[in-house]
């Protein structure tokens, strides 16, 4: 039950995160005009990954796409790439995780297969979240660098007589959306990986077998085989199913798909 809840919650959190990454990528407000020097501007500039916009106080907004690839800064291209990779990985992760959900039955799919799919989607979500966070952080760093550069050259002109105010840009809403969305996707991915551990068959239990030595009545019972920790006694509170009413000689080991939680 806890595994199903963790998996389901991980899926939902990742879904919200990826929706946020898509929204952030499409948003125009990655950088917005810094209004520190002129809080009552009649013209407000803001820029996204795909186009730049100008909103006039008259109510008119004009947006122009970046109709060039080669003319764009390499950093912007890198941010675009990171965000797209994040979306693609996230989308694939979502697709995989849908089939991996414990609450959804697809034919006779083994739980081990579901565990593998859950782990795969979890890793995809983690990488997707990291891509988004990296993309947004690179853009934010670019903004900070440009902000201080333009602050240093804030006013230029002929002997200070004519002022040319350089437009400075600060963090836009899309950056915060991207950071939060990337974080959610990352958290969702971690939750999926945690859920995978609960889904995976941790051990194959070998049933107690008695070997009757002639003249002795000592029963030898080997401990359960543990895949992860090597040999040892079955100290965990695992259910060991008997094969029914059989003589001890007839008891065989039946690895059951119900042997894990």
């Amino acid at each position: 039950m806890a595994v199903t809840a963790c998996q389901g919650l991980g899926f939902v959190v990742s879904l919200i995160g990826i929706a946020g990454i898509i929204a952030a990528t499409c948003m125009d407000q990655w950088s917005t005009q810094d209004l520190y020097n002129n809080p009552v501007t009649a013209v407000f500039n803001y820029q996204g990954l795909w186009r730049s916009c100008v909103r006039e106080s008259s109510g008119f907004t004009e947006c122009r796409g970046y109709f060039t690839l080669l003319g764009l800064p390499a950093m912007l291209q890198a941010v675009r790439a990171l965000m797209i990779v994040g979306i693609v990985l996230g989308a694939i992760g979502l697709l995989v995780s849908i089939f991996a959900l414990k609450c959804i039955r697809i034919g006779s799919m083994e739980d081990s297969a579901k565990a593998n799919m859950t782990l795969t989607s979890g890793i995809m979500f983690i990488v997707s979240g990291l891509c988004a966070i990296a993309g947004v952080s690179v853009f934010a760093n670019m903004l900070v660098t440009n902000f201080w550069m333009s602050t240093a050259n804030m006013y230029t002109g002929m002997g200070g007589m004519v002022q040319t105010v350089q437009t400075r840009y600060t963090f836009g809403a899309a950056l915060f959306v991207g950071w939060v969305a990337g974080g959610l996707t990352l958290i969702g991915g971690v939750m999926m990986c945690i859920a995978c551990r609960g889904l995976a068959p941790e051990e194959t239990n070998y049933k107690a077998v008695s070997y009757h030595a002639s003249g002795h009545s000592v029963a030898y019972k080997p401990g359960g085989f543990k895949a992860s920790t090597g040999f040892g006694s079955n100290t965990k509170n695992k259910k060991i199913y008997d094969g029914g009413a059989r003589t001890e000689d007839e008891v065989q080991s039946y690895p059951s798909k119900h042997d894990y939680v």
Partner: antibody
Amino acid sequence: QVTLRESGPALVKPTQTLTLTCTASGFTFSSYGMSWVRQPPGKALEWVATISGGGSYTYYNPSLKDRFTISRDISANQLVLKVTNMDPADTATYFCARQSRGNAMDYWGQGTTVTVSS
Amino acid sequence: DIQMTQSPSTLSASVGDRVTITCKSSQSLLNSGNQKNYLTWYQQKPGKAPKLLIYWASTRESGVPSRFSGSGSGTEFTLTISSLQPDDFATYYCQNDYSYPLTFGGGTKVEIK
């Protein structure tokens, strides 16, 4: 067609409050910023105030102090300018105008002349 | 505040003349976001409301005759009337539409020579 019509008292006593109304028609009132501009007799145009399309943002001429209040009634398609503590220096023709592309004022009312005198 | 300085304040010309009015701003009116200059030109006749001629420094308003043209960038702008017509005798104002407070120039009165 787009029409803007200002209305208000022609004569106001000093210290009184002036209320000017501009009634708009022929366009979607809530989609455009609206401005008040005044012109003292024989002088240049002077921008007074601007209000955004939805009425959320207002901008005032700081040189005219805090006596001016611009507002709009979208349901009635009306732009309102209130001026408190009127002074003889406020004697002017008051125009209302619609803001368009480039923040330019593309349509103007015919103007209403306000004289401040005791 | 951005100061707008127009010159000349009065201009005497004859019908058919080419007329140039200059407007200078104390700060650049060029917006880096769209590379447009937020300068507007108006024409006003006595007792009438101003009429929009040119916005974005060089974009002619619809219905405005082609003899009116605007040019310039940054801080220096000009309004040119290629061939002055009797209907063009009026006062012309430039306006900063880039930053609040919106400011007008002192006006240039074009009168008959």
